[in-house]
Amino acid sequence: GSTVPPMVNVTCSEVSEGNITVTCRASSFYPRNITLTWRQDGVSLSHNTQQWGDVLPDGNGTYQTWVATRIRQGEEQRFTCYMEHSGNHGTHPVPSGNSHHHHHHHH
């Protein structure tokens, strides 16, 4: 089938002691091969500080996956989610302030 670019969605959830978990979800993409990673100051985070979900079918002939990491509250602007899929790439910031969701569709 033809390439379907992912929808990328970055969310934050509060956790204890001034830390938050940021999750980057990629959905509705095809083919299933994708790179999704968190970067701190432009440099990819070590693998042992990130958690990845499996790349799973989402029921529409496309796929979905996610990557998460824990960061200190107030340092959101230093982290970005980097996505590569079928030759396309994109960088997605962590939403700042009270805005806890960010969606972007790649073309």
Epitope: Q40, D41, G42, S46, T80
Partner: antibody, heavy 121, light 108 residues
């Protein structure tokens, strides 16, 4: 003014060890990632190692992995490079360089004057 | 690791001449993570072009950068004496980070 001052270089025998230091001043050290970059005599730049501001992310060049250890002491504004099993090819000027973050762009914006390490018998 | 090979290694250019050097990567690099640095003898490197095509502060407009994927280039539109230096490309798309082999530009 931002200042990075390296020290600890000198003459070391092959197989020996050395610890380089980089003393930082003029900025909030604990908020910047720092790299070590080296330059052998009459050669190009070679990236050596990186440590993020919070020591969470550390990377090494393949040529030094397993032999060199980068670390930092934020309260003392100091970066370190512990080098073991030194080889003649480690002979170089060693620079520490600050990793800036501005408007979503990251780059080396300040460098020390370097410290020279010579590995020779 | 991503190896960056620069060509030519050394080049001589006359004043006013157009100069182009290339940086070739062994695997794809996002343009956001590809910078160029200028280094003169006895000095530390300076950021020259960032994210493939953006001039750093203070860099003359005669410089330009372009490229994508595995091939990038730096061009000096009209060579001036102060441009004599060594230029390095640098990638942080993937770890380990790497510098290019360098292109030394001399005055003919």
């Amino acid at each position: 003014d931002v200042q990075l001052v390296e020290s600890g270089g000198g003459l070391v025998q092959p197989g020996g060890s050395r610890k380089l230091s980089c003393a930082a001043s003029g900025f909030t050290f604990s908020t910047f990632g720092i790299h070590w970059v080296r330059q052998a005599p009459e050669k190009g730049l070679e990236w050596v190692a990186y440590i993020s501001y919070d020591s969470r992310t550390i990377y090494y060049a393949d040529t030094v992995k397993g032999r060199f250890t980068i670390s930092r002491d934020n309260p003392k504004n100091t970066l370190f490079l512990q080098m073991t099993s030194l080889r003649s090819e480690d002979t170089a000027m060693y620079y520490c360089a600050r990793w800036a973050y501005e408007g979503g762009v990251n780059y080396f914006d300040n460098w020390g004057q370097g410290t020279t390490l010579t590995v020779s018998s | 690791q991503i190896v960056l090979t620069q060509s030519p290694a050394i080049m001589s250019a006359s004043l006013g001449e157009r100069v182009t050097m290339t940086c070739t990567a062994t695997s794809g690099v996002s343009s956001s993570y590809l910078h160029w640095y200028q280094q003169k003898p006895g000095s530390s490197p300076k950021l020259w072009i960032y994210s493939s095509s953006n001039l750093a502060s203070g860099v003359p407009a005669r410089f330009s950068g372009s490229g994508s994927g595995t091939s990038y280039s730096l061009t000096i539109g009209s060579m001036e004496a102060e441009d004599a230096a060594t230029y390095y490309c640098h990638q942080f798309h993937r770890s380990p980070l790497t510098f290019g082999t360098g292109t030394k530009v001399e005055i003919k």
